[in-house]
């Protein structure tokens, strides 16, 4: 009975999410393998988040709006491990917008989800950020490593969206 009611609940939750995401990829987790964590297909998952690499070239504002429509934000990178996971799926000759910007040009960088900007957990390329005119951050491959660079916000780039996993 307990298992049956849990399955019914899951099915109704899945139906609820189906109107937003036509397909979900779910894995069982938790100590009793009773919880399912899901990401929209074909998003990738890492820890408690789902990631989507958009190859559509758009400005920073349009990229953030695009993520928002999908229930996500431009990516907020919190750890080196997270960045290493993300960069596995990126092309080394491309640049991708992050959810990091400095809208007033005061070098007060801010994440789209209001996560505090911690200077100790940043991965700027050497010498970056280097221009108050360049108010949006990308991640790109330079000098044999992935790192961040400040760029003009209106220049179209690819982007990375991030959302919390869906638990059912």
């Amino acid at each position: 009975n307990f298992m049956y009611s849990k399955t019914v609940k899951r099915l109704s939750k899945l139906q609820e999410y189906q109107q937003y995401y036509p397909s979900l990829t779910c894995v069982m987790e938790g100590k009793d393998m009773e919880d399912w964590s899901c990401c929209p297909t074909p998003w990738t998952s890492f820890q408690s988040s789902c990631y989507f690499i958009s190859t559509v070239m758009q400005s920073w504002t349009k990229s953030q709006n695009n993520c928002s429509v999908m229930g996500a934000d431009l990516v907020v990178i919190n750890t080196k491990e997270e960045q290493d996971f993300i960069t596995q799926n990126l092309k080394i000759n491309s640049a991708y917008f992050l959810g990091l910007s400095d809208p007033k040009g005061w070098r007060h960088w801010q994440w789209v989800d209001q996560t505090p900007y911690n200077k100790n957990v940043t991965f700027w390329h050497s010498g970056e950020p280097n221009s108050p005119d360049e108010r949006c951050a990308i991640i790109n491959f330079r000098s044999e490593e992935w790192g961040w660079n400040d760029v003009h916000c209106h220049v179209p780039q690819k982007s990375i969206c991030k959302m919390k996993k869906i638990y059912i």
């Epitope: 504002t61 953030q64 040009g105 005119d133 108010r135 949006c136 003009h152 209106h154 220049v155």
Partner: antibody, heavy 121, light 111 residues
Framework: EVQLLESGGGLVQPGGSLRLSCAAS????????MSWVRQAPGKGLEWVAT????????YYPDSVKGRFTISRDNSKNTLYLQMNSLRAEDTAVYYC??????????????WGQGTTVTVSS | DIVLTQSPDSLAVSLGERATINCKAS??????????VNWYQQKPGQPPKLLIY???NLESGIPDRFSGSGSGTDFTLTISSLQAEDVAVYYC?????????FGGGTKVEIK
């Protein structure tokens, strides 16, 4: 007073090359992103190129990409536009302008008087 | 590319009367409460001059008879009381996304 003085325009044959210069004074040139905008005779305005203050990032519309190169020499307070493989439709007055950011966008706040480029055989 | 369509193409207004110019974008140029549309004035034989930025902010040194309004895709430049020195072509421009694009221009003349 901000002054932007373009030079280098002239008559050139299709397929030819030309280098425009823009000498800036009255601003700390090395801190400014700069742009070129053109205006064909009797027509509207068209953005041509932008370069950031350090000169390491450049941007172009598809209409000139691969043919035009924007560059700068901050020690000389000068902006350049190298134009190759010129076409009749590149005939225009070319203006240099300073770029001022506005949140996630920008404005072109100071403009030079322009230099005329004519591409004709 | 974002297309900006200005209307009318030309406008004849009596001295002291109001002039209104419209600019329609092919997609929204707003983000987080700001609109990325600017207005420029170009007099014959002169370079363009910035009047309004961010849809409604008056550039320093521009007379306050000029004003801008609008958001999303629809924007307006208003000259509240036309003066002889306002005879010019007016252009809207978007800076939300490259390539920056300009409207086709509106020629303002005195009736």
């Amino acid at each position: 007073e901000v002054q932007l003085l373009e030079s280098g325009g002239g008559l050139v044959q299709p397929g030819g090359s030309l280098r425009l210069s823009c000498a800036a004074s009255g601003i700390t040139f090395s801190t400014y992103t700069m742009s070129w905008v053109r205006q064909a005779p009797g027509k509207g305005l068209e953005w041509v190129a932008t370069i950031n203050s350090g000169g390491d990032n450049t941007y172009y519309p598809d209409s000139v990409k691969g043919r035009f190169t924007i560059s700068r020499d901050n020690s000389k307070n000068t902006l350049y536009l190298q134009m190759n493989s010129l076409r009749a439709e590149d005939t225009a007055v070319y203006y240099c302008a300073t770029y001022r950011p506005y949140y996630y966008g920008s404005v072109l706040d100071y403009w030079g008087q322009g230099t005329t480029v004519t591409v004709s055989s | 590319d974002i297309v900006l369509t200005q209307s009318p193409d030309s406008l004849a207004v009596s001295l002291g009367e109001r002039a209104t110019i419209n600019c329609k974008a092919s997609q929204s140029v707003d983000y987080d409460g700001n609109s990325y549309v600017n207005w420029y004035q170009q007099k014959p034989g002169q370079p363009p001059k910035l009047l309004i930025y961010g849809a409604s902010n008056l550039e320093s040194g521009i007379p306050d008879r000029f004003s801008g309004s609008g958001s999303g895709t629809d924007f307006t430049l208003t000259i509240s009381s036309l003066q002889a020195e306002d005879v010019a072509v007016y252009y809207c421009q978007q800076s939300d996304e490259d390539p920056w694009t300009f409207g086709g221009g509106t020629k303002v003349e005195i009736k």
